[in-house]
């Protein structure tokens, strides 16, 4: 708390500018009008205030807006956002994606903070769902965001949002998460033609059931071995040699190099030797 003292003569701030960096904490408290600060928040970030001075400015805003800052102020907080507590942020009603982006930019290059987590939570809850534009924004700043959501949270992601997901956004997902995401992706991309569909669905196939893999094998998709190795073992086991051959196309030769690894190893053990021999790869069941 800064003690209430009268502003010295001639020091009353007419605008937020560089001259304020020479003000002591008590002078900032006494001479800067909170309403002026609120309307000129965009200037604060251009001025090299100390952390202690920023504390005073935050205190003034807190007094002006005890129920929480309006979005017009929030959007221009800049580095002052780093001074906010999760409790402060829970009072906010952030609805604009531009505001979200502006605040995520402040934390860019750093790991998730409690403040940012609270902000995202408030924003997504306010929107009612994790829509495509929001997901697009969040994964741009936090590529691991999608895979940090629980299967329960992912189940509320609308299929339309799946269009925002890039292959790298799924890199850290586990099998349980892909089980939830795959049916959504299948729904989202259902109206695409064969080759385009496969390009989009490929990253999600770690959650695909056997019947979908069988269907893909009829479409000349030429799945690469890296994708095949990420498929669910229980989904691969019932596939016939002919189906795997069709699924992989020219990449079928890669099975030899992966014969000791899952799911290839387990699949080989389920096949008749006569069938494996038709591949001409020397695979031993």
């Amino acid at each position: 708390e800064v003690e209430k003292t009268a502003c010295p003569s001639g020091k009353k701030a007419r605008e937020i500018d560089e001259s304020l960096i020479f003000y002591k904490k008590w002078e900032l408290e006494a001479c800067v009008d909170a309403a002026l600060l609120a309307t000129q928040m965009d200037r604060v970030n251009a001025i090299p205030f100390t952390y202690e001075q920023l504390d005073v400015l935050k205190h003034k805003l807190d007094e002006l807006y005890p129920q929480g800052y309006p979005e017009s102020v929030i959007q221009h907080l800049g580095y002052l956002f780093l001074k906010m507590s999760p409790e402060d942020i829970r009072k906010w009603n952030v609805t604009s994606l531009e505001t979200l982006k502006a605040l995520l930019e402040v934390n860019k290059g750093h790991e998730m903070s409690p403040q940012v987590a609270t902000l995202i939570d408030r924003f997504v809850k306010g929107r009612g769902q994790l829509d495509k534009d929001t997901l697009d924004t969040l994964t741009a700043f936090y590529p691991g965001y999608l895979c940090s959501l629980s299967p329960e949270e992912l189940s509320s992601v609308p299929p339309s949002s799946i269009w925002a997901v890039r292959p790298q956004d799924l890199d850290t997902c586990d099998p349980r998460q892909l089980d939830v995401l795959y049916p959504k992706a299948r729904l989202a991309f259902q109206n695409m033609n064969g080759s385009e569909y496969f390009v989009k669905i490929q990253s999600f196939l770690g959650g695909a059931p056997t019947e979908d893999l069988k269907a893909l094998s009829q479409q000349n998709v030429s799945m690469d071995l890296a994708t095949f190795m990420k498929l669910r073992t229980d989904a691969v086991l019932p596939l016939t040699v002919a189906e795997v051959q069709k699924l992989l196309g020219p990449h079928v030769e890669g099975l030899k190099a992966e014969e000791r690894h899952r799911p290839v190893r387990d699949w080989i053990l389920r096949q008749r030797q006569d069938d494996l021999d038709t591949l001409g790869l020397g695979l031993q069941g």
């Epitope: 790991e111 903070s113 987590a117 936090y142 691991g144 895979c147 940090s148 959501l149 949270e153």
Partner: nanobody, 116 residues
Framework: QVHLVESGGGSVQAGGSLRLSCVAS????????MRWYRQAPGKEREFVSA???????SYADSVKGRFTISQDNARKTVYLQMASLKPEDTAMYYC??????????WGQGTQVTVSS
């Protein structure tokens, strides 16, 4: 940089229990996702369990109902309580931490051996 250290492994008879711990240090960020994987001799590393940013959990079918993942309040330690252990649970158990930025970190592992 993040450092993970697992402990709690050991030898146990079938039907017995063990509790694995994984302690994280360094900048893990807020609410990282913590997962346990395991690797049996001559096999690939496989997913065992996860605890996500909202504190909900998931399990591989093979351990569901027998294993329980949990985290302490400081969020820097994750546990794997393993009960009704079977010989097929024998493996090296690894802890993995994933941050919201997508950085992944693995521990060195702790050995679990279950004899019949």
């Amino acid at each position: 940089q993040v450092h993970l250290v697992e402990s709690g492994g050991g030898s146990v008879q079938a039907g017995g229990s063990l509790r694995l711990s994984c302690v994280a240090s360094g900048d893990t960020g807020y609410q990282p996702t913590m997962r346990w994987y395991r690797q049996a001799p001559g096999k690939e590393r496989e997913f065992v369990s996860a605890i996500y940013s909202d504190q909900t959990t998931s399990y591989a079918d093979s351990v569901k109902g027998r294993f329980t993942i949990s985290q302490d309040n400081a969020r820097k330690t994750v546990y794997l309580q393993m009960a009704s252990l079977k010989p097929e649970d024998t493996a090296m158990y690894y802890c993995k931490l994933t941050t919201r930025r997508g950085s992944e970190y693995w521990g060195q592992g702790t050995q679990v051996t279950v004899s019949s």
